[in-house]
Amino acid sequence: DYKDDDDKLDFPGDGRAVWSQNPNLSPVNESQLFLYDTFPKNFFWGVGTGAFQVEGSWKKDGKGLSVWDHFIATHLNVSSRDGSSDSYIFLEKDLSALDFLGVSFYQFSISWPRLFPDGTVAVANAKGLQYYNRLLDSLLLRNIEPVVTLYHWDLPWALQEKYGGWKNETLIDLFNDYATYCFQTFGDRVKYWITIHNPYLVAWHGYGTGLHAPGEKGNVAAVYTVGHNLLKAHSKVWHNYNRNFRPHQKGWLSITLGSHWIEPNRAESIVDILKCQQSMVSVLGWFANPIHGDGDYPEVMTKKLLSVLPAFSEAEKNEVRGTADFFAFSFGPNNFKPLNTMAKMGQNVSLNLRQVLNWIKLEYGNPRILIAENGWFTDSYVQTEDTTAIYMMKNFLNQVLQAIRLDGVRVFGYTAWSLLDGFEWQDAYNTRRGLFYVDFNSEQRERRPKSSAHYYKQVIGENGFTLREATPDLQGQFPCDFSWGVTESVLKPESVASSPQFSDPHLYVWNATGNRMLHRVEGVRLKTRPAQCTDFITIKKQLEMLARMKVTHFRFALDWASVLPTGNLSEVNRQALRYYRCVVTEGLKLNISPMVTLYYPTHAHLGLPAPLLHSGGWLDPSTAKAFRDYAGLCFRELGDLVKLWITINEPNRLSDVYNRTSNDTYQAAHNLLIAHAIVWHLYDRQYRPSQRGALSLSLHSDWAEPANPYVASHWQAAERFLQFEIAWFAEPLFKTGDYPVAMREYIASKTRRGLSSSVLPRFSDAERRLVKGAADFYALNHFTTRFVMHEQQNGSRYDSDRDVQFLQDITRLASPSRLAVMPWGEGKLLRWMRNNYGDLDVYITANGIDDQALQNDQLRQYYLEKYVQEALKAYLIDKIKIKGYYAFKLTEEKSKPRFGFFTSDFKAKSSIQFYNKLITSNGFPSENGGPRCNQTQGNPECTVCLLLL
């Protein structure tokens, strides 16, 4: 291999400009992440196979041995040589699979030794000839265009034995003879020919690493000789076709070139970019530069591989240059694994197909491109439920679409790889790449469509990507009494006001004796004034931030442990209560109304007074009584000013803390639910009549979608996630007074089968009566949509009881902490709540995203816009009684994901202005604007009403 140095080199093409383009594409232009659009009209949709991988029947009907048949016997530990999908026998099944997909072409390869057992063109093997004729005729009958590869690695063993394979120039003419026969015999029915599939791997792994047949290794010169001969063989065949067959057959011919992609360690480093360029040209450029470039090897190779790289004469350069009618490109796992497949040059391997297509465009003058192989792999145990393959395909296909639509890359067709599970070269049968699952041990080798086949069929049918879930953005406004809020977690009360200057009557002189101390001036007494709320520094800061936010509501949580250190009313921290009253009163002076959360547990800190924590916390039912006493105190002290109360923030997330066993989780949740209900009744009976407020508890309410929409168990898992996450609390409160039947039955069934020892607590008659209806509105903390799949799990934990596993959709816009930005999930959640639990008032009590930016937080702005849009649609279209939206959150915490509008040191981010605009517009008014809320709208008597109030 060539030495790595950092000298600046000149390249004929301009591929390296790809890395110099701004890599920081806007994080919120979703079209740059995922583009909902169609492919060009008449886009060429296809699927491919390689003969050796799928045909089977390796010595049937007169077929000769190939190098791979020999390699399996000598180098690979393959239990059965009759594995494969047996396409030679089950042609009809392949055709049905193609029909299912609705492809416009089928790319397959002809097995040279099946036509000519010893490799030389004499009389063709009749049965082999019959098979390919039947295949071609059947395809045309179905309006499926054949794309035929002459050589996909299965060289006749006789030629390897006799000539040493591709090391020998003799093969150039033998290959041309074979190609001529194919053009003569099949050319009337074939418009697209590929000479050789991925010659790089033939040379590199066949003769360099020994991973591929014929398994030779260690001779670097042989690697480049083989490459040279493959190029010349291709060139000869192209000229042959061009001269002798194209005039009447009117087809096109190319060679499929494969590559990886690589990204620089440092985007701004010229040295790293050069290394990436070297990595690309040493793989893709090795073959592409002679054919699609200037006819010679890339300069970086000729300079560094002087002794081992054969040279092209000027005549040969002219001969090889331009010998492709389009750029056939392969991008798949064979060019990525194992790691010695490519020269990484110390840079980062990447699966960014869009980028590599742009590189080809820039490096080789924007050729027409056929993606002749693209896809990934799954493990051999995966059958038809290949969920991750859908995401890989979706990602690759969308990158192709973006390259076409956004970058002007001229891709005219796409080959999904592969039609069938089959033999995967050095991986043998340990990985699968098919869109159709084949059980290699079954007699009939049925082709069962995998999820990826369903997905590909859908994309072909739609000729691209339709955004089903989202509806167009609306213009419109929220009602005038809409709460525009911001949420903060627990406010820690300041123990003493931070401004002593008005409470100390003495006068001081500083540094009088040079000791930098204060000295009291005797005999002077100043006037003091009573303590004021603004003496609390944190309140001052809070008010400043809230004023900048322009919100109408501020949601914050009290610190139970600060208010009642002992957990009971024997010791009340009056100063803490005063602090909270100050927060509320000062906010009200700015017309900012409070929504107060009584109890806000966090993962790290349960937020309980220490004595309650030590006596079992929420596992002790009597904690509910302590909570009642605490709530009563808060209602008494603050209730005249607070009209919106949240008892507990996200009790459904306490499973993160009480997670020793599921029964701990369920018992803690049960006690929390009872505690909430007791407090609701206390408020309802004793305080509501005079205070006229409303009270609920806020649930963590992420939406769930099936990770794989083609699998029933994923739909069930998504619904089950909602049952275990939201209905767990919503069902008892808003519907039946008991846990969801689905949840109870699922847990019971797992316990019966010995997969869990969980028991969901039961409600007594009194508890059922108490809990049912004990909330005034839906309070939903909604952040994202989760993609879920069914995965049976053993063990007695809440998380395992659900049998749910989460997947990340790599094509979705997501935050640094991997929260997917999926606004329509919010709408689905709101509709689901109403459909299941009735038409109650709704407050979105927390909605936000983490954004790394310390100042220009574009992702947060985009998120806010889209999620508020979704809330507006719910209000205007679905008539959901949405009363308020609280953005999460006011300030961020040090060393936590950055959710704040303000940094931990109170620096404002630009999303504040964006949120201001939403608030002042009360939504998204049309150009001429809706009625303004501060004007009286239609009711002349309203002014009188206000005066009377």
Partner: antibody, heavy 119, light 107 residues
Framework: QIQLVQSGPELKKPGETAKISCKAS????????MNWVKQAPGKDLKWMGW????????TYTDDFKGRFVFSLETSASTAYLQINNLKNEDMATYFC????????????WGHGTLVTVSA | DIQMTQSSSSFSVSLGDRVTITCKAS??????LAWYQQKPGSAPRLLIS???SLETGVPSRFSGSGSGKDYTLSITSLQTEDVATYYC?????????FGAGTKLEIK
């Protein structure tokens, strides 16, 4: 502090009516239901039922349906038990007991009112 | 109706002894069980709710345990003031029912 103060003992003839009062203090009366419990001399405790102090709705167990009436005077924070057509087997001490929404047993009890039935 | 059975109606014990009183429900009452102490001429006093939760002000020598149908009240070291009758009560379902009581007497 929370207190339930019951009226004094009653001496009645069979067929007469007894009305026992239970005055609550130290908490919001209509927040918590009031229960009535009978204890015959030397016998165990028997739950008679309860009254929802918010709505005034009364629930009686099977043995105490018909002659027994629970009622309220909310303004006076007082619950009443009235026994009509007294019988000998009604002779017992009657306790009022405040509940916690039926969740934690009865943490607060009146001292009891003895009803004696004698011809 | 759920029957609550206290196995022994009375117990003769010595001061300082560990005492265990049992209570059996006719069906699962899911820990919705209270224990009361009653002294002659007085109202019952709630000692324990939810089978195990000690009420405020109750000495720590009292403890409750059990689940399902079977429950126990334990007194680690009997004091003179503990001489009384002890009742269990289920509040799982209506009608609420009490056990017949267990009377503790000093030997």
């Amino acid at each position: 502090q929370i207190q339930l103060v019951q009226s004094g003992p009653e001496l009645k003839k069979p067929g007469e009516t007894a009305k026992i009062s239970c005055k609550a203090s130290g908490y919001a009366f209509s927040n918590y239901g009031m229960n009535w419990v009978k204890q015959a001399p030397g016998k165990d405790l028997k739950w008679m039922g309860w009254i929802d102090t918010d709505t005034g709705e009364a629930t009686y167990t099977d043995d105490f349906k018909g002659r027994f009436v629970f009622s309220l005077e909310t303004s006076a924070s007082t619950a009443y038990l009235q026994i009509n057509n007294l019988k000998n087997e009604d002779m017992a001490t009657y306790f009022c007991a405040r509940e916690e929404y039926g969740l934690f047993g009865f943490p607060y009890w009146g001292h009891g009112t003895l009803v004696t039935v004698s011809a | 109706d759920i029957q609550m059975t206290q196995s022994s109606s009375s117990f003769s014990v010595s001061l300082g002894d560990r005492v265990t009183i049992t209570c059996k429900a006719s069906e699962d009452i899911y820990n919705r069980l209270a224990w009361y102490q009653q002294k002659p001429g007085s109202a019952p006093r709630l000692l324990i709710s939810a089978a195990t939760s000690l009420e405020t002000g109750v000495p720590s020598r009292f403890s409750g345990s059990g689940s399902g149908k079977d429950y126990t009240l334990s007194i680690t070291s009997l004091q003179t003031e503990d001489v009384a009758t002890y009742y269990c009560q289920q509040y799982w379902s209506n009608p609420l029912t009490f056990g017949a009581g267990t009377k503790l007497e000093i030997k």
